[in-house]
Interface confidence: medium
């Protein structure tokens, strides 16, 4: 399955409006940093299947737009920046969505790759576990912003190994 | 691909009332609202309600007194209710599948030309 | 609610030509929240552009959209057949209803 053009394109504008959230100096809340234990073994370049990596990614983007959908994102967060953020989130899951039932096939479910996913899954339990420790604080979700940030280029990174491997 | 498959009648009796079932098939891998939108040719593309991934809906007020949708997530399964048909209610409706409540729509049911006349 | 006027209502150009049509709401609408879709007869509306100026999965580059409060526009920089169709922009924000506009319908010389 090849990913359009306008993906890759949509990541880039997923990523700039991250950087755009940004309300506050990451310096002011460098007490409040936390290792979020990104699965980064998800992510590097181990033999995957194509279908495996598409359902990682697609796991990725999905637990971010949730995370970022909240009413408690709407009080912390500029609300248009968040509704282009949504938009971008919703034309990547459905290009994923797309290649995926094109690589697995309706048949096959992404369960196969259950280990990948939860592991994504946990990761984002991790971070909303914080948040509300944290109070869902302004430092807090400057922290998480950063975080987002640097899955997502990770995440973008494994789409453009997959791009290049075709 | 994702795929919206819609089925019921084309022709309604004034006065009578409309249903129409959406199935959702492909691997549906998110929450999502199923949005029900119609074309008829005076009034063009109108919006009449959503039931969201959680079951609360939103409706048109215009509709509101006579519409109603219901889900049956266990069959991908979303159905759309609408009484008291009158001839101008004659049009084209449409499921068609949004992820937030404010993202366009990439996915449409191919349509149910429905008629409303004696 | 918000209204939604497109111009013209119906329109017709020569293949290679540059084609312009408008949409203007009744209230001003974040760029954000404006949608544009194509739809051919006898098929349901298709996404072409999201968010004002977005192409969607698959659409051809010869399509732009631009714009921002009460104004906006398609594009299509080098009119082919295929593109004969009606467009209709569309707007949603949050509070329903969402709404749609009357449609231009692109016809070829």
């Known amino acids: 399955c090849d990913l359009p053009q306008t993906h890759s394109l949509g990541n880039r504008r997923a990523l700039i409006l991250l950087a755009q959230m940004r309300r506050i100096s990451p310096f002011s809340c460098l007490k409040d940093r936390h290792d979020f234990e990104f699965p980064q073994e998800e992510f590097d370049d181990k033999q995957f299947q194509k279908a495996q990596a598409i359902s990682v990614l697609h796991e990725m983007i999905q637990q971010t737009f949730n995370l970022f959908s909240t009413k408690d994102s709407s009080a912390a967060l500029d609300e248009t920046l968040l509704d282009e953020f949504y938009i971008e989130l919703d034309q990547q899951l459905n290009d994923l969505e797309s290649c995926v039932m094109q690589e697995v096939g309706v048949i096959e479910s992404p369960l196969m790759y259950e280990d990948s996913i939860l592991a994504v899954r946990k990761y984002f339990q991790r971070i909303t576990l914080y948040l509300t420790e944290k109070k869902y604080s302004s430092c807090a979700w400057e922290v998480v912003r950063a975080e987002i940030m640097r899955s997502f280029s990770l995440s973008i990174n494994l789409q453009k190994r997959l791009k290049s491997k075709e | 691909q994702v795929q919206l498959k819609q089925s019921g009648p084309g022709l309604v009796q004034p006065s009578q009332s409309l249903s129409i079932t959406c199935t959702v098939s492909?691997?549906?891998?998110?929450?999502?609202?199923v949005h029900w939108i119609r074309q008829s040719p005076g009034k063009g593309l109108e919006w009449l309600g959503v039931i969201w991934s959680g079951g609360n809906t939103d409706y048109n007020a215009a509709f509101i007194s006579r519409l109603s949708t219901t889900k049956d997530n266990s069959k991908s399964q979303f159905f759309f209710k609408m009484n008291s048909l009158q001839a101008k209610d004659t049009a084209i409706y449409y499921c068609?599948?949004?992820?937030?409540?404010?993202?366009?729509?990439?996915?449409w049911g191919q349509g149910t030309l429905v008629t409303v006349s004696a | 609610q918000i209204v939604l006027t497109q111009s013209p209502t119906i329109m017709s150009a020569s293949l290679g030509e540059r084609v312009t049509m408008t949409c203007t709401a009744s209230?001003?609408?974040?760029?954000?929240?404006l949608h544009w879709y194509q739809q051919k007869p006898g098929s349901s509306p298709k996404l072409l552009i999201y968010s004002t100026s977005n192409l969607a999965s698959g659409v051809p580059a010869r399509f732009s959209g631009s714009g921002s409060g009460t104004s906006y526009s398609l594009t299509i920089s080098n009119m082919e057949a295929e593109d004969a169709a009606t467009y209709y922009c569309h707007q949603y924000h949050r509070s329903p209803p969402m709404t749609f506009g009357g449609g231009t319908k692109l016809e070829i010389k």
């Open positions: 209230s001003s609408v974040s760029s954000t929240y």
């Open positions: 068609a599948r949004g992820r937030g409540n404010y993202v366009p729509f990439t996915y």
């Open positions: 492909g691997i549906s891998l998110t929450s999502y609202g």
